[in-house]
Interface confidence: medium
Amino acid sequence: QEDEDGDYEELVLALRSEEDGLAEAPEHGTTATFHRCAKDPWRLPGTYVVVLKEETHLSQSERTARRLQAQAARRGYLTKILHVFHGLLPGFLVKMSGDLLELALKLPHVDYIEEDSSVFAQSIPWNLERITPPRYRADEYQPPDGGSLVEVYLLDTSIQSDHREIEGRVMVTDFENVPEEDGTRFHRQASKCDSHGTHLAGVVSGRDAGVAKGASMRSLRVLNCQGKGTVSGTLIGLEFIRKSQLVQPVGPLVVLLPLAGGYSRVLNAACQRLARAGVVLVTAAGNFRDDACLYSPASAPEVITVGATNAQDQPVTLGTLGTNFGRCVDLFAPGEDIIGASSDCSTCFVSQSGTSQAAAHVAGIAAMMLSAEPELTLAELRQRLIHFSAKDVINEAWFPEDQRVLTPNLVAALPPSTHGAGWQLFCRTVWSAHSGPTRMATAVARCAPDEELLSCSSFSRSGKRRGERMEAQGGKLVCRAHNAFGGEGVYAIARCCLLPQANCSVHTAPPAEASMGTRVHCHQQGHVLTGCSSHWEVEDLGTHKPPVLRPRGQPNQCVGHREASIHASCCHAPGLECKVKEHGIPAPQEQVTVACEEGWTLTGCSALPGTSHVLGAYAVDNTCVVRSRDVSTTGSTSEGAVTAVAICCRSRHLAQASQELQ
């Protein structure tokens, strides 16, 4: 999902510190940045979130806020501090003129400032016709554990807490932070105000139509009667949850954010902090038929982002728009004509559609998984959600062509049994943002903190790329792909796996001058090969073909073009065993695949040879896909032969541990 490269407007005001009566000046050479929503109608100028550097204490935040007020007053400007943040992010929310931004950016401790913006409920429409009875019999779905050990926080509209679907299951907190409704003639009608939140609470834990019938919920009101809220209100809500968690630690927490606004650095940062505090966040991908990476919190990597599909597993169309898509979506879930509690009366049902409903399904599934295995980390939960999803059932033709390869073809499903998945080696594919077309552009794909990067590959639609390499960054391996001259840009593709007690390293061989090509193997005792990458500095690799078949007894070896440096990912972990599987096609073909068999998990995916007509390699579930340029356009068949190389692994240690538990 989105990291630091969101498509939002960034205005960098590199301002030298003035004396201006500051007791402390900002550190030499640092510049605070200003951000605002790229979608103009959603901007809320006049209110700003001032985010301070990570280690700033509450007292310093308050002092900085007071200093801003004092300096503004000296210039004849009135300011109002609306909230001082602490617990998640240090900073404050201030109402002030935009004229004061230059001044504010020069304050000590300031990291960045973000203009407030709107967020919106992600269900369309809010009230269709009443549907009675629901399409399925209530007794057809009776899960073994209804998520009773888990608390689900819902940040949404107000709710009708005495609806029979949710009465006694949802505690309405006293948290409320919503903007005024638009329009002078707007009438607050309780049933409309409660519509969105009531329906979603019912989808998560409703007695009759809920996914996790045993889950208890807490609701926070961050959306007004028109389904509109603010980034700042959502931030304060997330802070409220964090403080509640600290005051009264309970079991696992799931936070459902069925809302979306434009890309927001600060909202994504708050989600990251809450996720790192052990909270599972689930959000709507958005209903804009657009790249989910352009929206928040959908673009936050730590959040589980959910797109919407219908009963036929097709992406949901919502009027002229529809579900968002792209690499920031983790998976899809039912989101069309979903039956749930209607706020029209305490026994009414209604159907609603949208990525909010899809996210509510996944929040319910997550609650059930966490109730069965309360110790699951966010990374483990995400991997399980992906593992148990229905694969390759979505018609990708609905998505824009350039997004199809990036969008996960996964529809959420409950595990057949909530226990017993522990033996599996879980892996997922993480795509980077697009590098952009400049000659030296690179793209970086990262795994979550408690995942291991087991392999790295790259992909370019033009075929002009310079491969990829695994490199250390901040004490962790990342996957970096390199664009080539004349290329339209590249993607880096990381294979991220859960491998407890793993010790992984990268072994590199520089380009070989010999005609045999470059080779590298895992030479440390007990280390096995989990992935191969190759990177080259030349603009275009020749058609030289290295021998594809490795000598027998050399499974721990990567082979590549003689002009490329080759990188082997070598891991040691208890009981880890891996094998190389290849599928070569002598005739030219646009796509070559090779899959790991049952019980084995794909950790590495690469192409042989690494010549320029190969667009790249990437993993889709347990299949390695190698894409080549359309031969009809290259006009050459001599370099048409391509081999897809999969590395398939399993962990005997995990299997044993699982058997001991049973």
């Epitope: 009675t132 009875p133 007794d139 009465e167 006694g168 007695r207 026994t347 009414c348």
Partner: antibody
Framework: EVQLLESGGGLVQPGGSLRLSCKAS????????INWVRQAPGKGLEWIGR????????RYNEKFKGKATISRDNSKNTLYLQMNSLRAEDTAVYYC???????????WGQGTLVTVSS | EIVLTQSPATLSLSPGERATITCRAS??????LNWYQQKPGQAPRLLIY???NRATGIPARFSGSGSGTDFTLTISSLEPEDFAVYYC??????????FGGGTKVEIK
């Protein structure tokens, strides 16, 4: 062990009023709604209303609005049913019952008989 | 207001026999239906909640089924202590709680 103990029943003159008590023990009082249900001799069960001891919120059967008032004293873990303008047809056994999840009643008091007669 | 109709009003059976009591709601109620047993001079006792879930301590011979408008309480093999009056109860909007008229299971 969860227990609900009603008291306050007896003979009442028509037009009179009375207050029934329901003492709860063996569980976290504020977490469960308490309902009052009555049963006339030889007849079925009739729901009067409920209170959420956590926030004091009440709901009533339309039939009993203005006639019945449900209240609670959290310091005593006790619920009350105040009945006014009693008539002969209000003669019944009155039960308090705990709502486990919404409106399924998992624990009941033993009941207290109220007889309205001159 | 939802009306719950129980049938039969009286069921005369011998110990060991199977008892089936039905409860029909006048409109859709999902799975929000509970069953209670009441013996003379005693308070009702919850048997089944949400149409098919046995309450704590209830023997396996009691089972509930149905959803929507038609529900059934089944006692697979009557024990002497099972002869009592059985009530169905639903959760509705106004009034929130409605009881059926009751079915008396008596010894034949």
């Amino acid at each position: 062990e969860v227990q609900l103990l009603e008291s306050g029943g007896g003979l009442v003159q028509p037009g009179g009023s009375l207050r029934l008590s329901c003492k709860a023990s063996g569980y976290t009082f504020s977490r469960y709604g308490i309902n009052w249900v009555r049963q006339a001799p030889g007849k079925g069960l009739e729901w009067i209303g409920r209170i959420d001891p956590g926030n004091g919120g009440t709901r009533y059967n339309e039939k009993f609005k203005g006639k019945a008032t449900i209240s609670r004293d959290n310091s005593k873990n006790t619920l009350y049913l105040q009945m006014n303008s009693l008539r002969a047809e209000d003669t019944a056994v009155y039960y308090c019952a705990r709502a486990n999840d919404g409106y399924s009643f998992d624990y009941w008091g033993q009941g207290t008989l109220v007889t309205v007669s001159s | 207001e939802i009306v719950l109709t129980q049938s039969p009003a009286t069921l005369s059976l011998s110990p060991g026999e199977r008892a089936t009591i039905t409860c029909r709601a006048s409109q859709y109620v999902g799975s929000y239906l509970n069953w209670y047993q009441q013996k003379p001079g005693q308070a009702p006792r919850l048997l089944i909640y949400d149409a098919s879930n046995r309450a704590t301590g209830i023997p396996a011979r009691f089972s509930g089924s149905g959803s929507g408008t038609d529900f059934t309480l089944t006692i697979s093999s009557l024990e002497p202590e099972d002869f009592a009056v059985y009530y169905c109860q639903v959760w509705d909007s106004s009034p929130p709680v409605v009881f059926g008229g009751g079915t008396k299971v008596e010894i034949k």
